[in-house]
């Protein structure tokens, strides 16, 4: 039985030009996480596997930071940014656990951010 | 340039082990993952497993498990796969290939080492 | 195991003409699939990645695209080099996978 669940930041914004931290947090099971896929709608992101380390897409390779931790730094970002993330933790032997944040590129410098989210 | 280069064939008993070796130059090999791929004759591509040299870690297809082992020696570059408990459906083509720093495509292959299994 | 399916498993075309194959996948891969081409008695060669970028010194008649399950290989003007086997293959989750290949012969 999957028990486990997923806190992440959000609903975030930022300010274009500007990086944020994508970051997701696996609690309330044992399962060992094997892998990390970042995802932003129909695009992979980064993973993170616990045994090979990063891979960055190549669409990403230029604005994407692996980090911290399970994390993701998004950098130089554009309004085109703006929509939905996902990240899907792999476990064993629970499976797969997904969990959504929604990131806001906004034009104006008063963008506001959502409480950060620390893994402690 | 980057270079793999691998053993030679080998023909070996039903039963026995034996080690393909994968040597890597033209690189910091410590900032490659190592794949190995399985190809019997006039089939298609099977993967073995990968391992990243920097740290020791492998990830192995279940089917290979028990059979295949990979290491890799980060002061002589060279990457391992030990094959055991050989048997007649062993014999084939066996590849290693490299992927460099942040990415799991892999763009260079050895040439290949082909493995006869017989008595 | 993400199974990736390839057709079709062959196919017979002529110089000029345009191939196109597919791969799809048993379950959501993202864009992690890649393109290979081995010719006999050789090495499989990167084409394509991620799953539109074309390898370094990789032709322009070649493409890919797909996102999710379903992914497609276009040649769009075969070259008598072009004549190999061409194999799909997922990194989006272990073990990674390959489809079973597509053999693309001379009508």
């Known amino acids: 039985m999957m028990t486990g669940t997923i806190e992440t930041t959000g609903n975030i914004s930022a300010e274009k030009g500007g990086s944020i931290i994508l970051q997701c947090h696996l609690s309330s099971t044992t399962a060992q996480v094997t892998q990390v896929n970042w995802e932003q709608q129909d695009q992979l992101l980064a993973i993170c596997n616990a045994d090979l380390g990063w891979h960055i897409s190549p669409s990403f390779k230029d604005r994407v930071a692996p980090g911290p931790g399970l994390g993701l730094t998004l950098q130089s970002l554009t309004v085109n940014d703006t929509g939905e993330y996902f990240c899907i933790y792999h476990t064993y032997p629970d499976g797969t656990y997904t969990g959504r944040i929604f990131l806001e590129v906004l034009e104006s410098s008063v963008a506001e951010h959502g409480a950060r989210f620390q893994i402690p | 340039q980057v270079q793999l280069v691998q053993s030679g064939a080998e023909v070996v008993k039903p039963g026995a082990s034996v080690k393909v070796s994968c040597k890597a130059s033209g690189y910091a090999f410590t900032n490659y993952l190592i794949e190995w791929i399985y190809q019997a004759p006039g089939q298609g591509l099977e993967w073995i497993g990968v391992i990243n040299p920097g740290s020791g870690g492998t990830i192995y297809n279940q089917k290979f498990q028990g059979k295949a082992t990979l290491t890799a020696d980060k002061s002589s570059n060279i990457a391992y796969l030990e094959l055991s408990r050989l048997r007649s459906d062993d014999s084939a083509v066996y590849f290693c290939?490299?992927?460099?720093?942040?990415?799991?495509?892999?763009?260079?292959w050895g040439q290949g080492t082909l493995l006869t299994v017989s008595s | 195991d993400i199974v990736m399916t390839q057709s079709p498993s062959s196919l017979s075309t002529s110089v000029g003409d345009r191939v196109t194959i597919t791969c799809r996948a048993s379950q959501h891969v993202s864009t992690a699939v890649v393109w290979y081409q081995q010719k006999p008695g050789k090495s499989p060669k990167l084409l394509i990645y991620s799953p539109s970028y074309r390898y370094s010194g990789v032709p322009s008649r070649f493409s890919g695209s797909g996102s999710g399950t379903d992914f497609t290989f276009t040649i769009s003007s075969v070259q008598p080099e072009d004549f190999a086997v061409y194999y799909c293959?997922?990194?989006?989750?272990?073990?990674?996978?390959f489809g079973g290949g597509t053999k693309v012969e001379i009508k």
């Open positions: 293959h997922q990194h989006y989750s272990t073990p990674w996978t």
């Open positions: 290939a490299g992927s460099y720093g942040s990415s799991y495509t892999f763009d260079y």
